[in-house]
């Protein structure tokens, strides 16, 4: 699709290679307090139920993670047993978090990228037979 | 459980009221490729399958974020059919992002919090009978 | 230490149902599954049900019928209730836990068995 | 069903010797999650199963290292890269990614 360039032509653009590689972060996180309406029994309610486990890291900003594990490897059915016709799988997103750079630290942070299983889905397995 | 302080006491812990509003940010992302083993057929062999929208703003770090949409309100039963005794739900989770804090912008941001739909899930419906 | 103790009748007429039970110590229904395993003399393994750390269960649909696993968590025990014995459902009887640290679905520690004879 | 067949049944060897099994599964192991559900047991005379390796390749705790698993999809093997004397018994394999859960039929390995 192309860059799209932001009105001043003197700001780089946050998704080009121009991207500047050092900047000041306003620490005031906008949107404290998002719309969370914590989904918070779907992971007991879900045909493809998880657990949520604590990461933490004094060292990371945020410093709390929680991730999911799903509880098992087929699908609750219906009728409560859990159907190995169906497969539990963790959804797994990227998310951006801020690692402090040295133990020297003063106020320098490096971007980070992590992968973290957020919750379960059911899908249908793909069955490879024997040749 | 308390903050865990770092090894340096100059440091700020990252959990802290009293970590800095203001820091300077590497760009170069750790982790750049995360073994992200993109479950990319997830969305479609789901229960609960969902769609992937495109939510693009050249003013945000990362600029491209992939939204969940569920499609159907039930879930894919083992026929194919639509299930309505039982409901797809997204599943949400915070993230950070990087806002570009002016038009005026140098490099200069603001850390902002965003709840973005990761994908879905099949969910019991919470049944209510009128009194 | 993890241990796991089965205990049954010994022997079961034909016909008949066989209760077994499945005592732990060392760790948590809560926390772990339990499997029934059961091996008929000089043969191989052959694996049953297992109920699962949130109560949920997974039958081997051939015996599903004739089968039946309930726990209680209190009392750190699992049984298990086959019905319509035969001759052919002598074995030894096991049970073994669910290793799920790490998720592994493996059976890490198993009891020492309780013998079932099928007989008249 | 999923079948596991191993070969051989019974496997003779000297004190010392490495031994190696084989395992065959008629249909992929890999869970949708990218998880290859497949174990190996000892039963030794007398005893219940042990666990010995979990998930094709991870020694259980207190396994020795001589013991390693490796394989993937529908192909497994056991090594035993210097076979002692309380190696001795049956050696089963066994998958948990589909259900039923189940077992190959047996290796006995045994003093030539």
């Known amino acids: 699709a192309g860059i799209v360039i932001p009105q001043n032509p003197e700001c780089p653009n946050t998704g080009d290679k121009n991207f500047p590689q050092n900047v000041k972060i306003n620490l005031n996180v906008l949107n404290r307090k998002t719309n969370s309406r914590r989904a918070s029994d779907y992971h007991n309610r879900s045909t493809s139920p998880w657990n949520l486990h604590r990461n933490e890291d004094p060292e990371r900003y945020p410093s709390v993670i929680w991730e999911a594990k799903c509880r098992h490897l087929g699908c609750v059915n219906a009728e409560g047993k859990v159907d190995f016709h169906m497969n539990s799988v963790p959804i797994q997103q990227e998310i951006l978090v801020l690692r402090r750079e040295s133990q020297n630290c003063p106020h320098s942070f490096q971007l980070e990228k992590m992968l973290v299983a957020v919750g379960c889905t059911c899908v249908t397995p793909i069955v490879r037979h024997m040749g | 459980a308390g903050i865990v302080i770092p090894q340096n006491p100059e440091c700020p812990n990252t959990g802290d009221k009293n970590f800095p509003q203001n820091v300077k940010i590497n760009l170069n992302v750790l982790n750049r490729k995360t073994n992200s083993r993109r479950a990319s057929d997830y969305h479609n062999r789901s229960t609960s399958p969902w769609n992937l929208h495109r939510n693009e703003d050249p003013e945000r770090y990362p600029s491209v974020i992939w939204e969940a949409k569920c499609r159907h309100l039930g879930c894919v039963n083992a026929e194919g059919k639509v299930d309505f005794h039982m409901n797809s739900v997204p599943i949400q989770q915070e993230i950070l992002v990087l806002r570009r804090e002016s038009q005026n912008c140098p490099h200069s941001f603001q850390l902002e919090k965003m709840l973005v739909a990761v994908g879905c899930t099949c969910v019991t419906p919470i049944v209510r009978h009128m009194g | 230490q993890v241990q796991l103790k089965e205990s049954g009748p010994g022997l079961v007429a034909p016909s008949q149902s066989l209760s077994i039970t499945c005592t732990i110590s060392?760790?948590?229904?809560?926390?772990?599954?339990v499997h029934w395993v059961r091996q008929p003399p000089g043969k191989g393994l052959e694996w049953l049900v297992v109920?699962?750390?949130?109560?949920?269960?997974t039958y081997n649909s051939a015996l599903k019928s004739r089968l039946s696993i309930s726990k209680d968590n209190s009392k750190s025990q699992v049984f298990l209730k086959m019905n319509s014995l035969q001759t052919d459902d002598t074995a030894m009887y096991y049970c073994?836990?669910?290793?799920?640290?790490?998720?592994?679905?493996?059976?890490?520690?198993w009891g020492q068995g309780t013998s079932v004879t099928v007989s008249s | 069903d999923v079948v596991m067949t191993q070969t051989p049944l019974s496997l003779p060897v000297s004190l010392g010797d490495q031994a190696s099994i084989s395992c065959r599964s008629s249909?992929?192991?890999?869970?949708?999650?990218?998880?290859?559900?497949f174990h190996w047991y000892l039963q030794k005379p007398g005893q219940s199963p042990k666990l010995l390796i979990y998930?094709?390749?991870n020694r259980f705790s207190g396994v020795p290292d001589r013991f390693s698993g490796s394989g993937s999809g529908t192909d497994f093997t056991l090594k035993i890269s210097r076979v002692e004397a309380e190696d001795l018994g049956v050696y089963f394999c066994?998958?948990?990614?589909?259900?039923?859960?189940?077992f190959g039929s047996g290796t006995k390995l045994e003093i030539k």
């Open positions: 073994a836990r669910h290793y799920d640290r790490g998720y592994y679905y493996a059976m890490d520690y």
């Open positions: 060392g760790f948590s229904l809560t926390s772990n599954g």
């Open positions: 109920i699962w750390s949130d109560g949920t269960t």
């Open positions: 249909q992929s192991l890999v869970h949708s999650n990218g998880n290859t559900y």
């Open positions: 998930k094709v390749s």
């Open positions: 066994s998958q948990s990614t589909h259900a039923p859960f189940t």
